[in-house]
């Protein structure tokens, strides 16, 4: 039960995260005009990955796409690439994880296959989240650098007679959406990887030997291991109580060398 919940929650958290990454990528407010300590203008500028916008105090908003590809800064291109890679990996991860969900039965798919798919989607979510966080962080770093550069020469002009105010940009809402979404996708991926450990069926290479002790009937299984999923051999003896009901989810409750957190 715990594994199903972990897997389901991981899926939902990742889904929200990827939706957030897509939203952040499409948003126009990656950088917004800094209003603090700046001359007050009746025009508000903000920029996204794909276009820049201007909102007048009249309410009229005009957005212009970046129609050039070669003329754009390399950093912006890199951020775009990171976000797109994050979305693509996340989308594939979602697709894989849907089939890996324990609550969904597809033909005679074995638990070991579901475990593999869960692990695959988990890794994809982790990489997707990292791509988004990296992309947003690169953009934020670019903004900070430009901010201080434009602050240093905020007013330029000929002999101080005519002043040109340079527009300074600060963090836009999309950056925060991106960071949160990337974090959620990462957490979802970790949860999927954790769930994967409890999904694969327990297998043994020899039959358990029964020892009849007074009182309870207890079977000891020395040195059982998971061959199918490539997990390391279990050095702990695991007691199996004949009398107690046990769910599938409780099978892999001991730690292995493939702990992802």
């Amino acid at each position: 039960m715990a594994v199903t919940a972990c897997q389901g929650l991981g899926f939902v958290v990742s889904l929200i995260g990827i939706a957030g990454i897509i939203a952040a990528t499409c948003m126009d407010q990656w950088s917004t005009q800094d209003l603090y300590n700046n001359p007050v203008t009746a025009v508000f500028n903000y920029q996204g990955l794909w276009r820049s916008c201007v909102r007048e105090s009249s309410g009229f908003t005009e957005c212009r796409g970046y129609f050039t590809l070669l003329g754009l800064p390399a950093m912006l291109q890199a951020v775009r690439a990171l976000m797109i890679v994050g979305i693509v990996l996340g989308a594939i991860g979602l697709l894989v994880s849907i089939f890996a969900l324990k609550c969904i039965r597809i033909g005679s798919m074995e638990d070991s296959a579901k475990a593999n798919m869960t692990l695959t989607s988990g890794i994809m979510f982790i990489v997707s989240g990292l791509c988004a966080i990296a992309g947003v962080s690169v953009f934020a770093n670019m903004l900070v650098t430009n901010f201080w550069m434009s602050t240093a020469n905020m007013y330029t002009g000929m002999g101080g007679m005519v002043q040109t105010v340079q527009t300074r940009y600060t963090f836009g809402a999309a950056l925060f959406v991106g960071w949160v979404a990337g974090g959620l996708t990462l957490i979802g991926g970790v949860m999927m990887c954790i769930a994967c450990r409890g999904l694969a069926p327990e297998e043994t290479n020899y039959k358990a030997v029964s020892y009849h002790a007074s009182g309870h009937s207890v079977a000891y299984k020395p040195g059982g291991f998971k061959a199918s999923t490539g997990f390391g051999s279990n050095t702990k003896n695991k007691k199996i109580y004949d009398g107690g009901a046990r769910t599938e989810d409780e099978v892999q409750s001991y730690p292995s060398k493939h702990d992802y957190v």
Partner: antibody
Framework: QVQLQQPGTELVKPGASVKLSCKAS????????MHWVKQRPGQGLEWIGN????????NHNEKFKSKATLTVDKSSSTAYMQLSSLTSEDSAVYYC???????????WGHGTLVTVSA | DVVMTQSPSSLTVTAGEKVTMSCKSS????????????LTWYQQKPGQPPKLLLY???TRESGVPDRFTGSGSGTDFTLTISSVQAEDLAVYYC?????????FGSGTKLEIK
């Protein structure tokens, strides 16, 4: 079409206050900043300030900050400007005008002539 | 505050003549975000409220005759009337519509001979 109704004249005594009104129609009143402009007889135009009817946010010309108070009544689509401690310097025509493309003022009221006289 | 300087203060021309008037601002009115100049031109006839002629320095308001054209960028702007008509007798104001407080030029009075 956009219409801005302003009373024609206001005669007030020095030191007194006056509240000028500007009733707007023909557009969504709460969506656009309302600007106020002063023009003394035979002189140029002076921007007093503006107010956003939806939230009451405003911008003022520092020169008029203690002189003019801008308010709105959304229910009647009316903008108000209260002028306090009036002197002969405040005798002028006061116009209201909502913001337009390019932050310009395309529609103007006919103006209220305020005369400060003992 | 942004200072708007208009010149000349008055002009006397004959009908049909071409007229140019200048407006200079103490700060650039060019917005880098959309490459638009936030300068507005108004015409005020005696006893009337001002009338919008041009916004964004060169965009003609609907209903304004095409003899009125605006040009310039940054801090230097020009209003040109290609062929002055009798009804163009008025005071022409330029306005900074970029920085608060919005400021107007002192005006150019156009008189017809």
């Amino acid at each position: 079409q956009v219409q801005l109704q302003q009373p024609g004249t206001e005669l007030v005594k020095p030191g007194a206050s006056v509240k000028l009104s500007c009733k707007a129609s023909g557009y969504t009143f709460t969506s656009y900043w309302m600007h106020w402009v002063k023009q003394r007889p035979g002189q140029g135009l002076e921007w007093i300030g503006n107010i956003h009817p939806s939230n009451g946010g405003s911008n003022h010309n520092e020169k008029f900050k203690s002189k003019a108070t801008l308010t709105v009544d959304k229910s009647s689509s009316t903008a108000y400007m209260q002028l306090s401690s009036l002197t002969s310097e405040d005798s002028a025509v006061y116009y209201c005008a909502p913001i337009y493309y390019g932050n310009s003022l395309a529609y103007w009221g006919h103006g209220t002539l305020v005369t400060v006289s003992a | 505050d942004v200072v708007m300087t208009q010149s000349p203060s008055s002009l006397t021309v004959t009908a049909g003549e071409k007229v140019t008037m200048s407006c200079k601002s103490s700060q650039s009115l060019l917005n880098s975000g959309n490459q638009k100049n936030y300068l507005t031109w108004y015409q005020q006839k005696p006893g009337q409220p001002p009338k919008l002629l041009l916004y964004w320095a060169s965009t003609r308001e609907s209903g304004v005759p095409d003899r009125f054209t605006g040009s310039g960028s940054g801090t230097d702007f020009t209003l040109t009337i290609s062929s002055v008509q009798a009804e163009d007798l008025a005071v022409y104001y330029c306005q900074n519509s970029y920085f608060y407080p919005f400021t107007f030029g002192s005006g150019t009075k156009l008189e017809i001979k």
